[in-house]
């Protein structure tokens, strides 16, 4: 899986979209989980409605909401009032029994609010983020990282 970067501004809302094959995942509930570190387990944050037919209903856990367009094949997660500690690695998952398939790996990046950080230089406003070499911009607030794109010898 590629990792897609979604950038959000502290204090604002961030919407993460996870497209999937609606036929392949027909009848499956979805979930949003947070990975502990780079290689740790993924802890469930929120999941769609227990009744798959009601997956379009928005479900909240704290400041995180999830809703699923099962016909269009798009899972949408909203992080409201984004905070620095919301930054991290996440996954969109498709659930079947006790198993979970990863739909998309997501890196949520929290950027400083230029209005709050008056000592910040190069003031910017949310827009198209830079893409890494050989990576494509998914849409205005995301970019993809190819896993293994940045080679590391075993060893910030």
């Amino acid at each position: 899986h590629n990792t897609t970067v979604f950038q959000g501004v502290a204090g604002q809302s961030l919407q993460v979209s996870c497209p999937y094959d609606s036929m392949k995942h027909w009848g499956r509930r979805k979930a949003w989980c947070r990975q502990l570190g780079e290689k740790g387990p993924c802890q469930r944050v929120v999941s769609t409605h227990n009744l798959w037919l009601l997956s379009f209903l928005r479900r909240w856990n704290g400041s995180t909401a999830i809703t699923d367009d099962t016909l269009g094949g798009t899972l949408t997660i909203t992080l409201r009032n984004l905070q620095p500690h919301d930054a991290g690695l996440y996954q969109c998952q498709s659930l079947h029994g006790s198993e979970a398939d990863t739909l998309r790996k997501v890196l949520v990046e929290v950027l400083a609010d230029p209005l709050d950080h008056r000592d910040a230089g190069d003031l910017w406003f949310p827009g198209e983020s830079e893409s890494f070499e050989d990576a494509h911009v998914e849409h205005s607030i995301s970019r993809s990282l190819l896993e293994g794109e940045i080679p590391f010898p075993p060893t910030s």
Epitope: V5, G88, L107, H117, F132, P154
Partner: antibody, heavy 120, light 106 residues
Framework: EVQLVESGGGLVQPGRSLKLSCPAS????????MAWVRQAPTKGLEWVAS????????YYRDSVKGRFTISRDNAKNTLYLQMDSLRSEDTATYYC?????????????WGQGTLVTVSS | NIQLTQSPSLLSASVGDRVTLSCKGS??????LAWYQQKLGEAPKLLIY???SLLTGIPSRFSGSGSGTDYTLTISSLHSEDLATYYC????????FGGGTKLELK
């Protein structure tokens, strides 16, 4: 093991330039916000500049704005600090610091620092 | 910018003592406060972030507390290896460090 190794420091005359480098290893560099923090001899810590994971967003303290440029090369896993128009008050040990995944609000790992001395 | 004032600037204590270090902000910090330990000739080391979250691998004798503008780092029982300078650091508005508290042996 996370490693950050600063280089490029040294003695430089006021008004001149210097470029610091910080190759990183032991983690997926492109996942992390990065920063430079400095410490003048026998003084406290002072945040200098931060950069987002992709390098598209940068932040500077007022006293270095327009003179210093933070950048990164994710293909080379390296953080840089280009320092121009150096002043005597820029004399300090410069630390390369790693933020957390997706942010450079706080710094979880630091290099050992490189000393920059600005003097005529 | 938020200014951070640490007190005392120098603290003498004995091994086994309960030690309390203070950090006061010029504005509300919203719990976005971290504590760093720096030993002589070494790079700073993160101990605590978001006021009271202990970094993995940091001994449990270290704890953080506070809210608003007033924050505290507590060492429940001082060890000799804890002798160092401690800096508070806020990331609520801008990024600023306190002036530091040097902890020395009495």
């Amino acid at each position: 093991e996370v490693q950050l190794v600063e280089s490029g420091g040294g003695l430089v005359q006021p008004g001149r330039s210097l470029k610091l480098s910080c190759p990183a290893s032991g983690f997926t560099f492109s996942y992390y916000g990065m920063a430079w923090v400095r410490q003048a001899p026998t003084k406290g810590l002072e945040w200098v500049a931060s950069i987002s994971t992709g390098g598209g967003n940068t932040y500077y303290r007022d006293s270095v704005k327009g003179r210093f440029t933070i950048s990164r090369d994710n293909a080379k896993n390296t953080l840089y600090l280009q320092m121009d128009s150096l002043r005597s008050e820029d004399t300090a040990t410069y630390y390369c610091a790693r933020g957390d995944i997706g942010t450079a609000y706080w710094f979880t790992y630091w290099g050992q620092g490189t000393l920059v001395t600005v003097s005529s | 910018n938020i200014q951070l004032t640490q007190s005392p600037s120098l603290l003498s204590a004995s091994v086994g003592d309960r030690v309390t270090l203070s950090c006061k902000g010029s504005q509300n910090i919203n719990n976005y406060l971290a504590w760093y330990q720096q030993k002589l000739g070494e790079a700073p080391k993160l101990l605590i972030y978001k006021t009271n979250s202990l970094l993995t691998g940091i001994p449990s004798r270290f704890s953080g507390s506070g809210s608003g503008t007033d924050y505290t780092l507590t060492i429940s029982s001082l060890h000799s290896e804890d002798l160092a300078t401690y800096y508070c650091y806020q990331y609520n508005n801008g990024w600023t460090f306190g002036g530091g508290t040097k902890l020395e042996l009495k």
